[in-house]
């Protein structure tokens, strides 16, 4: 049977259906790939140019292979088994009305099915399987792979590699709240918040009294101590870590190969020797990088630094004075850490709304 002979795969959405917003299409495919990565060791990375392992396209009729689309209804899409070139690619009939709901044809459900083929799965004769050849609507928000699907995909790739377990909870030491504590970097990681300091990090669930501490090397042996900036793109399960002129990508808690990469590949000028803090704003789809008295803004959709940057922090973030240790995005606010204190900042109204101790997250 056909399967990919590597764990890390790339995909590219070559073109977009006009039926939906681009960001909805991006999100749907990210979630469709996640359905398969959740139950296997496979990891998927989106490319914006060049040839990817899995090319995704929307087309009418004849579109470069022998399998012409047939107009509305009938064949909704097709995909090729793993391999080079056209193999692994997934084609969607543009004559369908693609949606994210029960109306028209639900793109997520068809994408999960077609990507199953792209990963090497054949059709199933089990009507509960997503690989059953006939389309039927299921609620995407409650969608689960059938036991058959999981068994079949794991027969090709095995079960997921367990992320290293974080150490069991412990209460903060009694001295913790009495220290004037500063952090190197702070970011959400899924539902948790990670507070990096030297060679370790604290992590906790907001609202939970328990605090946990883990050394960086015990969970990610390839990541150095002294992380200086971090941010998460939660919709992609991606965590970015920065130290000096390098950055690392952690995907689903697993470090990606081919990292670290140079921060200059992101568009920083040569004068930038390290990033003090970074934060991803999901509403704007921008990353804000804080460097001394300035900040840079990076567009994650275009994978480009925005023009006309850097800009002065003090001018564009009223009430914020450099230098910044760390920034956290949480519930539509930025938490800007400076020494033993943090400023709660509302980016919508561009103002500081609270001043707190850095350790307020720990129930201090």
């Amino acid at each position: 049977r056909s399967r990919w002979m590597k764990r890390y795969l790339t995909y590219r959405i070559y073109n977009y259906t006009p039926d939906m917003k681009r960001e909805d299409v991006d999100y749907i495919f990210q979630k469709a790939f996640q359905v398969w990565s959740d139950v296997t060791p496979l990891r998927f990375r989106k490319l914006h140019k060049d040839e990817a392992d899995i090319m995704i396209l929307f087309a009418f009729g004849a579109h470069g292979d022998f399998n012409y689309f047939d107009g509305k209804g009938g064949t909704l899409a097709h995909a090729f088994y793993p391999g080079p070139g056209i193999q692994g690619d997934a084609h969607f009939d543009e004559a369908e009305t693609w949606t994210k709901s029960f109306q028209g044809t639900n793109l997520f459900l068809v994408a999960v099915h077609e990507l199953g083929h792209s990963l090497g799965l054949q059709h199933s004769n089990n009507p509960k399987s997503i690989m059953y050849p006939t389309y039927r609507y299921l609620n995407p928000s409650t969608f689960r792979l059938s036991a058959d699907d999981i068994r079949n995909i794991q027969s090709l790739y095995g079960a997921p590699v367990k992320p290293p377990s974080l150490t069991k909870p412990s209460s903060p030491p009694s001295t913790f709240c009495h220290q004037s504590l500063s952090f190197d970097a702070v970011t959400t990681v899924g539902e948790k918040i990670f507070f990096f300091k030297d060679w370790f990090f604290w992590w906790k669930l907001p609202g939970s009294p328990a605090t946990n501490i883990t050394s960086i090397s015990s969970i990610w042996p390839s990541i150095p101590s002294g992380i200086q900036a971090a941010y998460e793109i939660e919709s992609r399960n991606q965590l970015f870590l920065f130290k000096d002129e390098k950055y690392w990508l952690i995907n689903n808690l697993v470090p990606e190969p081919h990292y670290p990469r140079s921060i200059y590949s992101l568009g920083f000028s040569a004068s930038v020797k390290k990033v003090d803090a970074a934060v991803f704003d999901p509403l704007r789809q921008k990353v804000y990088f804080f460097v001394d008295k300035h900040y840079w803004r990076y567009d994650v959709r275009q994978e480009l630094m925005d023009p006309a940057y850097p800009k002065l922090i003090s001018t564009h973030f009223p009430g914020i004075k450099p230098k910044i240790d760390a920034v956290l995005y949480f519930k539509r606010h930025y938490y800007i850490f400076q020494g033993a204190y943090q400023l709660e900042y509302d980016p919508l109204f561009r103002r500081v709304t609270k001043t707190l101790k850095s350790t307020s997250w720990f129930g201090c």
């Epitope: 056909s2 040839e51 579109h63 470069g64 292979d65 391999g83 070139g85 054949q122």
Partner: antibody, heavy 122, light 103 residues
């Protein structure tokens, strides 16, 4: 090593019939889409027909539709092209070519046979 | 239906020359274009698939580029064994061929 060997070509009169065979080895024949491509003397390449791995799906160029039939015998690792109602313009070297595996054909011909010459003349 | 237009139909060049052959589709074929080399009396051989991927065993002086409707095959430094006919192809459609001859 992948090998494709065509046979069955020859001289035939207009309106006559001929059956070409292509013996395949070096790969799991039943997993792959297979094609026939032809080349008239001194001319370019022209795709003729393809068949899916199980033989259930076939596709033909307009120029041969209704006259040619592609088939396969996976137990014998052999591809066939039954050519009826032959015309002078069917004179060509006929090549069999291997495509990618799976339910759909890409038309990526990664291995070709040496070809067999079919001459239609009175 | 999709049509492929290949140019030039013939080309004279010398050993060591850089040569470019182009292929144009009348509608987008994404990156689904292949290039073949055929020598007299022989079967065609796959050189480039998916517009830019080099088939195993093909010398690196051959390269392909393009996507959508416009594609090129480039031979960076012609060798004596490269004088042949070249075809672009997508699915059931071949270009008319480019005969590369010694100047």
């Amino acid at each position: 090593e992948v090998q494709l060997l065509e046979s069955g070509g020859g001289l035939v009169q207009p309106g006559g019939s001929l059956r070409l065979s292509c013996a395949a080895s070096g790969f799991t024949f039943s997993d792959y889409n297979m094609h026939w491509v032809r080349q008239a003397p001194g001319k370019g390449l022209e795709w003729v027909s393809y068949i899916g791995p199980s033989g259930g799906y076939t596709h033909y160029a307009d120029s041969v539709k209704g006259r040619f039939t592609i088939s396969r015998d996976n137990s014998k690792n052999t591809l066939y092209l039954q050519m009826n109602s032959l015309r002078a313009e069917d004179t060509a070297v006929y090549y069999c070519a291997k495509d990618i595996r799976g339910a759909y054909s890409s038309g990526l011909f990664d291995y070709w046979g040496r070809g067999t010459l079919v001459t239609v003349s009175s | 239906d999709i049509q492929m237009t290949q140019s030039p139909s013939s080309l004279s060049a010398s050993v060591g020359d850089r040569v470019t052959i182009t292929c144009r589709a009348n509608q987008s074929i994404y990156t689904y274009l292949n290039w073949y080399q055929q020598k007299p009396g022989k079967a065609p051989e796959l050189l480039i698939y998916a517009a830019s991927s080099l088939q195993s065993g093909v010398p690196s002086r051959f390269s392909g580029s393009g996507s959508g409707t416009d594609f090129t095959l480039t031979i960076s430094s012609l060798q004596p064994e490269d004088f042949a006919t070249y075809y672009c192809q997508q699915a059931g459609i071949f270009g008319q061929g480019t005969k590369l001859e010694i100047k």
